[in-house]
């Protein structure tokens, strides 16, 4: 079969970590240094891709499969495959076009990457404020006001139940 | 340019073992990827097994589990160790590295 099959097309068989050449009449030849095929069948090896300048390689380059590449420390990963990196803030801080900037007012991140998000709209869910928010938190939220007023049973209600589709904050 | 010799073909029955040697002289310093092809007459030129640029060794399906390609820098020589050999393994077979090929040496197995 194998050989049937090399009469129709012989760059079939080629394996990956190897390339069918066009220069030697279509025989399978492995890939050249720093270069990689992945898959069989190739007609060309890829060049390796190489981690410079703010990346780093977290994984070598193999004839059969590509270098990876991350960050180095103060920059994360954007992009399919680490395709560029982004500049660390502080939690608390946004990434802006002038750099990193603290977080506006009723605004948190609690991470080092991404933009700032408002804080959660306690009374939206019909509850109050238990903890205020800060640059770096969400506020958190606590019963309903109409919980805490004088005469309130201390056992909590079950909550209503809510519409298929929502869920809770 | 390298110059590659192989030798250890023979005649041997199915399921006996060869050991080919390939020895490399000259500018064996640009060697980084080595080979083993095989061919029959009339027969395109096929891979078998083969060192690659990050020394790590490959085989083609059909010498999976059977042959076993190995390198020794010391003695500038590649080896290719042919086990459980079958009829059909019946070939001549060539090193290769680069444009250097060596001039064959002849694999029969019959019973």
């Known amino acids: 079969f194998e050989r049937t099959r090399s009469l129709q097309d012989p760059c079939s068989n080629c394996p990956a970590g190897t390339f069918c050449d066009n220069n030697r009449n279509q025989i399978c030849s492995p890939c050249p240094p720093n270069s990689f095929s992945s898959a069989g069948g190739q007609r060309t090896c890829d060049i390796c891709r190489q981690c410079k300048g703010v990346f780093r390689t977290r994984k070598e380059c193999s004839s059969t499969s590509n270098a990876e590449c991350d960050c180095t420390p103060g920059f994360h990963c954007l992009g399919a495959g680490c395709s560029m990196c982004e500049q660390d803030c502080k939690q608390g801080q946004e990434l802006t076009k002038k750099g990193c900037k603290d977080c506006c007012f009723g605004t948190f991140n609690d991470q080092k990457r991404g933009i700032c998000r408002p804080w959660t709209n306690c009374s939206l869910d019909g509850k109050s404020v238990l903890v205020n928010g800060t640059k770096e938190r969400d506020v958190v939220c606590g019963p309903s006001p109409a919980d805490l007023s004088p005469g309130a049973s201390s056992v909590t209600p079950p909550a209503p139940a809510r519409e298929p589709g929502h869920s809770p904050q | 340019a390298v110059q590659l010799v192989e030798s250890g073909g023979g005649l041997v029955q199915p399921g006996g073992s060869l050991r080919l040697s390939c020895a490399a002289s000259?500018?064996?310093?640009?060697?980084?990827?080595i080979s083993w092809y095989r061919q029959g007459p009339g027969k395109q030129r096929e891979l078998v097994a083969w060192?690659?640029?990050?020394?790590?060794?490959h085989y083609v399906d059909s010498a999976k589990g059977r042959f076993t390609i190995s390198r020794d820098n010391t003695k500038k020589t590649t080896y290719l160790q042919m086990n459980s050999l079958k009829l059909e393994d019946t070939d001549v077979y060539y090193c290769?590295?680069?444009?250097?090929w060596g001039q064959g040496t002849q694999v029969t197995v019959s019973s």
């Open positions: 290769n590295s680069g444009d250097s």
């Open positions: 000259g500018n064996i310093s640009s060697i980084r990827v």
């Open positions: 060192i690659a640029w990050d020394n790590i060794a």
